[in-house]
């Protein structure tokens, strides 16, 4: 999948590790797609290094990336989304390393948003809802979501729930009474498209009611 140019001029350059990783985001800005790449070694001297993608493009042979600090990116409508593209790291006119990648297999969804938790007193449960921009998209519509929650004092004790809808019910009896909880959600492609987890949504914080001593039930907030 990846190859190094054999050229004496590049001897010094080839001592470096030019491994890189990329992710795509489809219809991230209207009908525009984006592709973001970065070197895996943060110490690579990127001064004269550029990225280029060729193949599986509409109307054009190749596209150049723009550089923003250590990140290289393209925003375009010209991804064919069928077959593999060749992504190369270049210095001058020489390719240092290339990878053949199908952009539909490196999709990173946009982070969910509008996460909220509503307590239902009568049902003794919490209804968790959130939104995703992918409901409106033509391509990456089907996602798996990972809802993670923890008691605020338990730094690393996250409970995870996977679901395909944007609504989840948490039973009150499964949570500690009179406790502050943090909850967040992320998404990953789940049908045809493959790739990576999105960034986490902003966290939402909620408090569970106290237990009502006479009935053994929690008091509403």
């Amino acid at each position: 999948e990846s190859g190094y140019a054999q050229n004496g001029d590049l001897e010094d350059a080839e001592l470096d590790d030019y491994s890189f990783s990329c992710y795509s985001q489809l219809e991230v800005n209207g009908s525009q797609h984006s592709l973001t790449c970065a070197f895996e070694d943060p110490d690579v001297n990127i001064t004269n290094l550029e990225f280029e993608i060729c193949g599986a493009l509409v109307e054009v042979k190749c596209l150049n990336f723009r550089k923003l600090q250590e990140i290289y990116f393209i925003e375009t409508k010209k991804f064919l989304l069928i077959g593999k593209s060749n992504i190369c790291v270049k210095v001058g006119e020489k390719s240092l390393t290339c990878k053949k990648i199908d952009l539909t297999t490196i999709v990173k969804p946009e982070a969910p948003f509008d996460l909220s938790v509503v307590y239902r007193e009568g049902a003794n449960d919490f209804v968790v809802t959130f939104n995703t921009s992918h409901l409106q998209k033509k391509y990456v519509k089907v996602l798996m979501h990972d809802v993670a929650y923890r008691q605020e004092k338990d730094e690393n004790k996250w409970t995870h729930v996977n679901l395909s809808s944007t609504k989840l019910t948490l039973l009150q009896r499964k949570l500690q009474p009179a406790a502050m909880y943090e909850i967040k959600v992320r998404s990953i492609p789940d049908h045809y498209f493959k790739g990576f987890w999105s960034e986490w949504s902003p966290s939402y914080y909620f408090r569970t009611p106290e237990i009502n001593n006479s009935s053994g039930e929690m008091d509403p907030i």
């Epitope: 550029e50 596209l63 990336f65 723009r66 550089k67 409508k77």
Partner: antibody
Framework: QVQLQESGPGLVKPSETLSLTCTVS?????????WNWIRQPPGKGLEWMGY???????TYTPSLKSRITISRDTSKNQFSLKLSSVTAADTAVYYC????????????WGQGTTVTVSS | DIQMLQSPSSLSASVGDRVTITCLAS??????LAWYQQKPGKAPKLLIY???RLADGVPSRFSGSGSGTMFTLTISSLQPEDFATYYC?????????FGGGTKVEIK
């Protein structure tokens, strides 16, 4: 085959508004690309003025930002340039062209139309 | 704004000569550079894009090289139809800017 054709008055009075239209054939201005205006004063070099993107958003060169408007009529597959408060310095050949943004070129150009600013 | 300094501003050459025009960007622009040819009374014509790639239908005697800040357009063997003005242009950042042009005249 993509073709672009500029049209509009060849003479504009100082302080008035210059209006030009670019008619595109062989490609829809709503499909992709940026649709640009470039001008060239007599005997001088080229100056990029701005574009309207296929999505309808616009970007202008800062030196003209207060005077320039680029719009489009999708039903006629046209995009237009308006330049207000013109002076003799705006006398130039005006070109429309396709490209830029995610590609590093203007691949199709109109033949150009000469606009003279004079009373 | 990124300044594009083109040199020379004019040159005289004969048919068959090798001609080199340079374009120096005031800051690094990667491969975001194009070269155009313009003949009197005509619109510019794309020759080279992405600094080194030959546009469709352009003769192979034209070539582009460079990346970053220093770019070169070379005509390996000048033909009678190549006498024209040549411009470089950067697409790296707004406003997109052109070089001042190089007029190639018959010696």
């Amino acid at each position: 085959q993509v073709q672009l054709q500029e049209s509009g008055p060849g003479l504009v009075k100082p302080s008035e508004t210059l209006s030009l239209t670019c008619t595109v054939s062989g490609y829809s201005v709503t499909t992709d690309y940026a649709w640009n205006w470039i001008r060239q004063p007599p005997g001088k070099g080229l100056e990029w003025m701005g574009y309207i993107f296929y999505s309808g958003s616009t970007t202008y060169t800062p030196s003209l930002k207060s005077r320039i408007t680029i719009s489009r009529d999708t039903s006629k597959n046209q995009f237009s340039l308006k330049l207000s408060s013109v002076t003799a310095a705006d006398t130039a050949v005006y070109y429309c062209a396709r490209g830029g943004y995610d590609v590093n070129y203007f691949d199709y150009w109109g033949q150009g139309t000469t606009v003279t600013v004079s009373s | 704004d990124i300044q594009m300094l083109q040199s020379p501003s004019s040159l005289s050459a004969s048919v068959g000569d090798r001609v080199t025009i340079t374009c120096l960007a005031s800051q690094t622009i990667g491969y975001w550079l194009a070269w155009y040819q313009q003949k009197p009374g005509k619109a510019p014509k794309l020759l080279i894009y992405a600094a080194t790639r030959l546009a469709d239908g352009v003769p192979s005697r034209f070539s582009g090289s460079g990346s970053g800040t220093m770019f070169t357009l070379t005509i390996s063997s000048l033909q009678p139809e190549d006498f024209a003005t040549y411009y470089c242009q950067q697409f790296f950042s707004y406003p997109w800017t052109f070089g001042g042009g190089t007029k190639v005249e018959i010696k």
